[in-house]
Interface confidence: low
């Protein structure tokens, strides 16, 4: 079929010069020469489907899947991977070919699979299929750590069933809130699997290997703290171990702690107590409730009671499968050039998510903050006032979530013009999208006030260049205007900008730019 576009599929391997684990680098710096993946038409397929040669990638390698399309006019595209779709931004190379890229940073098991690229051009629609797999037969994994009680000892063992064997560390903090951030001087790290000092305020265990770092916090109810406004909630999957620590401090040893599930005392063997005197001679008691492998019927309100403190509860919810709950509707924002603004996504998820923010094929690190109501929030403020599409992507072992944001920056239009033998075209960014007027400059109208309405063709911005909306207006040449100066003007609520063009030669000849505010 002669209407079919000429397609080239390539793989670019990036040498990661940032080999640190778990960092989201923007774009891998050093590239090897592209490898042609063929992209042959797939026989007996409904619709036009091109299939690239299978791609095998080393764990933690960074690659780009790239498609070059030699088709007339604009193209739009969409990537689909594991039931998630991701809009893509085609750009054009020096030979005016459409270029569509998918960057995979630090390849992991979850990023292996089929990548489908849907392309829509003015002439036709077609699909390109990439299959990406991990080269290594020994698939790397990094599993969230969990706790076990040490046989015959009052100590916790931290276990992470990961490959390669992870380094396990306990992260301990004895102060409250913000001062327990990872880099804080209040934080103590112990690179060992067994922890005997279980009286601290905040106890986490982290496991790290080539794939990154995963942490699990020891869920704690502190009877000396004012309870949260909303009941703390703990999610677990069927089969996972449950650990809740109840902690209380009193002036002397004359108090006891008990655990109840839905007003029924926990069975022996599902709890153990430890106590110690603190430096000021007050007594600290902790009582652990634990279930080595939870079932659906372990769901409910776990209440820790003390003979000397008000009791507090936590809601434990056992789920069959992990989840990510958040609204995935896309959001559009319009801000001024110097306005402070952050994108934010509020979500509830279990297990904890891994996430990235992406803009213009660059990935940015994603931070999560837990809120008091059981929700978490991720904010992205590093947009540098660049308009375009921003993508938040989150995943855990069982679920994936993608949310699109559009950022528009209110600014006055800037006009660029070009002319050919048969037409003159003007382009403008600026937001809100500008409207266009064309004017003819002549003896009768030396101030170029004579409006041209014939032969004008305005195009809505249907393509982004570097994240900016572009609007264009084209004037088809007629005998009536040949040899004259014409002026195209773009205007929006923030101002007007014009460009003057001489319509007598095939080359572009803009020579005056007017900026009228």
């Amino acid at each position: 079929n002669q209407d079919l576009p000429v397609i080239k599929c390539v793989l670019i391997n990036h040498k990661n010069n940032d080999s640190s684990v778990g960092k989201s680098s923007s774009y891998p710096m050093v590239s090897e020469s592209p490898e042609d993946l063929g992209c042959a038409l797939r026989p007996q397929s409904s619709g036009t489907v091109y299939e690239a040669a299978a791609v095998e990638v080393d764990v933690s390698a960074s690659i780009t899947l790239q498609v070059l399309v030699d088709a007339p006019g604009n193209i739009s595209c969409l990537w689909v991977f594991k039931h998630s779709s991701l809009n893509c931004q085609p750009h054009f190379d020096l030979q005016n070919r459409g270029v569509v890229s998918m960057v995979i940073l630090k390849m992991t098991e979850t990023q292996a699979g089929e990548y489908l690229l849907f392309i829509q051009s003015e002439a036709t629609n077609y699909t390109i299929l990439f299959t990406v797999s991990i080269r290594n037969t020994l698939l790397y994994t990094l599993r969230r750590p969990y706790f076990r009680k040490m046989e015959n000892q009052d100590a916790l063992v931290c276990i992470s069933e990961s490959v390669p064997e992870p380094i396990v560390e306990w992260v301990l903090c004895d102060s409250q809130g913000e001062s327990c951030k990872e880099e804080s001087p209040a934080v103590v790290k112990k690179e060992e699997k067994v922890l005997h000092e279980l009286f601290g305020t905040d106890i986490r265990c982290c496991a790290r290997n080539e794939l990154g770092r995963e942490c699990t916090r020891l869920f704690t109810i502190d009877l000396n703290q004012t309870p949260q406004t909303t009941l703390p909630q703990l999610f677990l999957k069927v089969g996972e171990p449950l650990w809740i620590r109840c902690k209380a401090v009193h002036v002397n040893h004359g108090f006891g702690l008990t655990w109840e599930l839905e007003n029924k005392a926990l069975e022996e063997g599902n709890y153990f107590e430890m106590s110690t005197y603190s430096t000021n001679r007050t007594m600290i008691r902790i009582l652990f409730a634990f279930v080595s492998s939870v079932a659906r019927n372990d769901t409910g309100y776990y209440t820790c009671s003390s003979s000397k403190h008000p009791s507090q509860s936590a809601l434990v919810t056992i789920v069959e499968k992990g989840f990510i709950n958040a609204t995935n509707s896309s959001e559009d924002y319009e801000i001024d050039q110097y306005e402070e603004f952050c994108f934010s996504v509020r979500f509830k998820a279990y297990p904890q998510i891994r996430c990235t923010w992406t803009f213009s094929r660059k990935s940015f690190p994603c931070e999560q903050k837990g809120l008091d109501n059981g929700y978490s929030i991720s904010k992205f403020c590093n947009h540098k006032h660049q308009p375009g599409e921003y993508i938040f992507h989150a995943e855990n072992d069982d679920a994936q979530f993608t949310k699109m944001f559009t950022l528009n920056i209110r600014r006055k239009p800037q006009v660029l013009a070009e002319a050919s033998a048969s037409q003159a075209s003007c382009f403008s960014d600026g937001y809100p999208l500008p409207s266009w007027t064309w004017k003819k400059c002549s003896d009768k109208s030396p101030n170029c006030t004579e409006e041209i309405t014939e032969g004008v063709w305005n195009r809505k911005a249907n393509r982004k260049v570097f994240g900016q909306w572009v609007s264009s207006s084209t004037l088809n040449m007629s005998e009536a205007i040949k040899g004259f100066l014409v002026k195209c003007c773009a205007y929006n609520s923030l101002g007007t900008s014009c460009e003057t063009i001489l319509l007598n030669s095939p080359g572009p000849f803009p020579f005056i730019q007017d900026n009228i505010s």
Partner: antibody, heavy 125, light 107 residues
Framework: QVQLVQSGAEVKKPGSSVKVSCKAS????????MHWVRQAPGQGLEWVGG????????FYAQTFQGRVTITADESTSTAYMELSSLRSEDTAVYYC??????????????????WGQGTLVTVSS | DIQMTQSPSSLSASVGDRVTITCRAS??????LNWYQQKPGKAPKLLIY???NLQSGVPSRFSGSGSGTDFTLTISSLQPEDFATYYC?????????FGQGTRLEIK
């Protein structure tokens, strides 16, 4: 080349302490581990403990827990092993050994690739 | 702690012989197992790491195999300088533990 030079032989009384030093040359103490291993006369090798000099994190065998202290001074590239409450069964040659981390088929493996010449500690009344 | 047991405790062989020493762990140590050679009055020397990888500078007549709990050190053709004591050691988890050693003597 990489060398580990240990302090000289020691004769100690039961109940006292001994501190053995191990100076690294040809590399700085920024490798992942520095280990201490002992060997009683005519016996096999026994791991005493190890330290990650960069962080000061220590690991000890249960047998020595509470009696042994391993430290490292990065500025002088020297590691130390102090053993207290000495008893006659602590008589042994004590070796320091540099930890090595080697990659093969998707995993990192840890071993001890460079050893000191050994320090004989004799505990006798 | 993980116990490491070597067999035999000692063995006699001649130059040119093929010799096999085995090491068993009390629980799985995956492939995190090293072999060392020690000569009288000398410090041990690392021969094999990760169960089967030859340490640089070690002759190719030495080889290692196994994973999980059972491991083997093989010397394909004994040389006079190979008569020594050999130790296996797990680095799967601290405390690192050694086998009791296998003494290889000249027949």
């Amino acid at each position: 080349q990489v060398q580990l030079v240990q302090s000289g032989a020691e004769v100690k009384k039961p109940g006292s302490s001994v501190k053995v030093s191990c100076k690294a040359s040809g590399y700085t103490l920024n490798e992942l581990f520095m280990h201490w291993v002992r060997q009683a006369p005519g016996q096999g090798l026994e791991w005493v403990g190890g330290i990650i000099p960069m962080s000061g994190t220590t690991f000890y065998a249960q047998t020595f827990q509470g009696r042994v202290t391993i430290t490292a001074d990065e500025s002088t590239s020297t590691a130390y092993m102090e053993l207290s409450s000495l008893r006659s069964e602590d008589t042994a040659v004590y070796y320091c050994a540099k930890g090595v981390r080697q990659y093969s088929y998707g995993r990192y493996y840890y071993g001890m690739d460079v050893w000191g010449q050994g320090t004989l500690v004799t505990v006798s009344s | 702690d993980i116990q490491m047991t070597q067999s035999p405790s000692s063995l006699s062989a001649s130059v040119g012989d093929r010799v096999t020493i085995t090491c068993r762990a009390s629980q799985s140590v995956s492939s995190y197992l090293n072999w060392y050679q020690q000569k009288p009055g000398k410090a041990p020397k690392l021969l094999i790491y990760g169960a089967s990888n030859l340490q640089s500078g070690v002759p190719s007549r030495f080889s290692g195999s196994g994973s999980g709990t059972d491991f083997t050190l093989t010397i394909s053709s004994l040389q006079p300088e190979d008569f020594a004591t050999y130790y296996c050691q797990q680095s799967y988890t601290t405390p690192w533990t050694f086998g009791q050693g296998t003494r290889l003597e000249i027949k």
